[in-house]
């Protein structure tokens, strides 16, 4: 949606820095948009020698870089912080690194959780 009416989406939420930033640590985030604005889900993480460290997940504001992406796929070669965004409820639950320059595709599966809705 996002064409004429306000959009509502739900995304997986996570903030590794939740204590300092005084937010929830994890759960579900309900994103309620303004008229004619799209909303996306995103994930960001670090990869230290093959160990994945989740940084943040949640709702992402209207961003053409995220349009019509069904899956959360990071394409940068070797960033300090990986980022992907997508459209679709909970599309940020799993995320992938597939560098544009080629190389192995790495998909990260989330551990099973019972998330709570953030208010």
């Amino acid at each position: 949606s996002g064409r004429g009416e306000a959009e509502t989406r739900e995304c997986i939420y996570y903030n590794a820095n939740w204590e300092l930033e005084r937010t929830n640590q994890s759960g579900l985030e309900r994103c309620e948009g303004e008229q004619d604005k799209r909303l996306h889900c995103y994930a960001s993480w670090r990869n230290s020698s093959g160990t994945i460290e989740l940084v943040k997940k949640g709702c992402w504001l209207d961003d053409f870089n995220c349009y019509d992406r069904q899956e959360c796929v990071a394409t940068e070669e070797n960033p300090q912080v990986y980022f992907c965004c997508c459209e679709g409820n909970f599309c940020n639950e799993r995320f992938t690194h597939l560098p544009e320059a080629g190389g192995p595709e790495v998909t990260y599966e989330p551990p099973p959780t019972a998330p709570t809705l953030l208010t």
Epitope: E29, C31, L39, C59, W60, L61, D63, F64, N65, T119
Partner: antibody, heavy 120, light 107 residues
């Protein structure tokens, strides 16, 4: 239209406290967070902290920890920033700014600013 | 804290010129970067968020690019109302921090 209206200019003595208000209108008050940013004369912008009006939680820059208190009154859609133990270096224009609840949290609407002068 | 370094600190340009301002973060901030314009005696105004997304109502001559640590704000054809100071700001982690500002002056 969306608007943030701040309280008027203040002149304070060193050691005193100042409380600046920021009244929001034109949007759902609890659907956005509010940041405070200050600017000393001729200087750049400095982020002081953020308050989440939906729950009242706050996060302050370490530099201001212990001296700053941000509060909100949902009945009047107003946020407050109180700075204590004022010194001359606190002379600045203080801005409130509306912050999206969603990443990457831009500050999309700003108040007109409140000039605080600290002088003996 | 994440340091944000802007360059140049000032630039002299003429109406119609293309102006480019750069901002470098001391560590990776992905796309958590915004650009603001400030005119003397006025509050800052949001131009760009998420490194490259244009805020509603901002003219399309403003554009942003970059990710990670290096970012750019470009004004494709400078207009008289664009003479101001521009700041970058990261919102990746608290405390949020600003660059030192770039003053765009009339040549």
């Amino acid at each position: 239209q969306v608007q943030l209206v701040q309280s008027g200019a203040e002149v304070k003595k060193p050691g005193a406290s100042v409380k600046v208000s920021c009244k929001a209108s034109g949007y759902t008050f609890t659907s956005y967070n509010m940041a405070w940013v200050r600017q000393a004369p001729g200087q750049g912008l400095e982020w002081m902290g953020i308050i989440r009006p939906s729950v009242g939680s706050t996060s302050y820059a370490q530099k201001f920890q212990g001296r700053v208190t941000m509060t909100r009154d949902t009945s009047t859609s107003t946020v407050y920033m109180e700075l204590s133990s004022l010194r001359s270096e606190d002379t600045a224009v203080y801005y409130c700014a509306r912050v999206s609840m969603y990443a990457p949290e831009p500050m999309d609407v700003w108040g007109q600013g409140t000039t605080v002068t600290v002088s003996s | 804290d994440i340091q944000m370094t802007q360059s140049p600190s000032s630039v002299s340009a003429s109406v119609g010129d293309r102006v480019t301002i750069t901002c470098r973060a001391s560590q990776g901030i992905s796309r958590w970067l915004a650009w603001y314009q400030q005119k003397p005696g006025k509050a800052p105004k949001l131009l760009i968020y998420a490194a490259s997304s244009l805020q509603s109502g901002v003219p399309s001559r403003f554009s942003g690019s970059g990710s990670g640590t290096d970012f750019t704000l470009t004004i494709s054809s400078l207009q008289p109302e664009d003479f101001a100071t521009y700041y970058c700001q990261q919102a990746f982690s608290h405390p949020w921090t600003f660059g030192g500002g770039t003053k765009v002056e009339i040549k």
